[in-house]
């Protein structure tokens, strides 16, 4: 499955939108920084079969979509930007779902992939727990926004490596 060029453009657009969503100066939030233990190894395309990498990407985008689709998220961000961001993520999910179906037919996805997906889910659980502990404060959301920008950048790099493998 070849991810369309529009997919990586969508990812870049999502990153730009997320960058524009900030409501307060991040300079006031240094003390709120937190180690979410991003599972960097899951974004290393070299150790994966293509089907596995696509599944990890799908999980990453799905969890990001879920995080920004909550009521708490709606209260935190400017509505029109949030809607545009969610639309970009939804389009990416559609692209990836088509690829997952196609690739899983070609390669048998080993158990190792389940571990990778679980690692991504646990990462997002840590983010959600942090937001709950910080009572969804503006600074907590700023920290999470910065963290998601970072993980989306990792996703973009993984997509680039996947295209080079084709």
């Amino acid at each position: 499955c070849d991810l369309p060029q529009t997919h990586s453009l969508g990812n870049r657009r999502a990153l730009i939108l997320l960058g524009q969503m900030g409501r307060i100066s991040p300079f006031s939030c240094l003390k709120d920084r937190h180690d979410f233990r991003i599972p960097q190894e899951e974004f290393d395309g070299n150790q994966f079969q293509k089907a596995q990498a696509i599944s990890v990407l799908h999980e990453m985008i799905q969890q990001t979509f879920n995080l920004f689709s909550t009521e708490d998220s709606s209260a935190a961000w400017e509505q029109s930007l949030l809607e545009k961001f969610s639309t970009e993520l939804y389009q990416q999910l559609n692209d990836l779902e088509a690829c997952v179906i196609q690739e899983v037919g070609v390669e048998e996805t080993p158990l190792m992939n389940e571990d990778s997906i679980l690692a991504v889910r646990k990462y997002f659980q840590r983010i959600t727990l942090y937001l709950i502990e910080r009572k969804y404060s503006p600074c907590a959301w700023e920290v999470v926004r910065a963290e998601i920008m970072r993980s989306l950048s990792f996703s973009t790099n993984l997509q680039k490596r996947l295209r080079r493998k084709d």
Epitope: P26, L30, R33, H34, D35
Partner: antibody, heavy 121, light 107 residues
Framework: EVQLVQSGAEVKKPGESLKISCKGS????????IGWVRQMPGKGLEWMGI????????AYSPSFQGQVTISADKSISTAYLQWSSLKASDTAMYYC??????????????WGQGTLVTVSS | DIQMTQSPSSLSASVGDRVTITCRAS??????LNWYQQKPGKAPKLLIY???SLQSGVPSRFSGSGSGTDFTLTISSLQPEDFATYYC?????????FGQGTKVEIK
């Protein structure tokens, strides 16, 4: 390879203006903040201020607020430190350094080589 | 502003010595503390971040500890290239502040 390359040494007279630069390469320039640090001759490190190149938001140390201006041009991955009217006491080495912003990553992990500014009549 | 106080301001030691530098913050900074090494005519170099994390490429003889207000940088066995000035820096809030520095000299 991550690099911060600063502009060359400057010799100026009191009252003159000056703008020094710091060009980032080997990483996504807008994903990190750029801080400026002063070191006067034989003295320690003093944090002056910082900029987020993604939106040019700035924060200054109270000691330097109104004395200098920090700016950035993300299209050329460059941050700037400028003075409108230099004083002899501005004579120092000025360093730029990369900061991860709100991400859990090392602070000031890469530094420029420094720009020596000499202000003398 | 948060004041950072280092001690001693200078020390003399021999190659192979265990060296300890302390840094005290005027208020709690949790673990938001970094240590830098600076050699004459060179830019500072990050050694330790978040109080105890060793920066990539830094020799394991360097270690950091502490939280709250009291922090320590330890060099387990001083090497010739370690003679330099060391600075602590708090990163919990603006304005970011550095300690005044500790110069490690050859005995």
């Amino acid at each position: 390879e991550v690099q911060l390359v600063q502009s060359g040494a400057e010799v100026k007279k009191p009252g003159e203006s000056l703008k020094i630069s710091c060009k980032g390469s080997g990483y996504s320039f807008t994903s990190y903040w750029i801080g400026w640090v002063r070191q006067m001759p034989g003295k320690g490190l003093e944090w002056m201020g910082i900029i987020d190149p993604s939106d040019s938001d700035t924060a200054y140390s109270p000691s330097f607020q109104g004395q200098v201006t920090i700016s950035a041009d993300k299209s050329i991955s460059t941050a700037y430190l400028q003075w409108s009217s230099l004083k002899a006491s501005d004579t120092a080495m000025y360093y730029c350094a990369r900061h991860p912003g709100l991400n859990w990553a090392p602070d000031f992990d890469y530094w420029g080589q420094g720009t020596l500014v000499t202000v003398s009549s | 502003d948060i004041q950072m106080t280092q001690s001693p301001s200078s020390l003399s030691a021999s190659v192979g010595d265990r060296v300890t530098i302390t840094c005290r913050a005027s208020q709690s900074i949790a673990e938001f503390l970094n240590w830098y090494q600076q050699k004459p005519g060179k830019a500072p170099k990050l050694l330790i971040y978040f109080a105890s994390s060793l920066q990539s490429g830094v020799p394991s003889r360097f270690s950091g500890s502490g939280s709250g207000t009291d922090f320590t940088l330890t060099i387990s066995s001083l090497q010739p290239e370690d003679f330099a000035t060391y600075y602590c820096q708090q990163s919990i809030d603006f304005p970011l502040t550095f300690g005044q520095g500790t110069k490690v000299e050859i005995k």
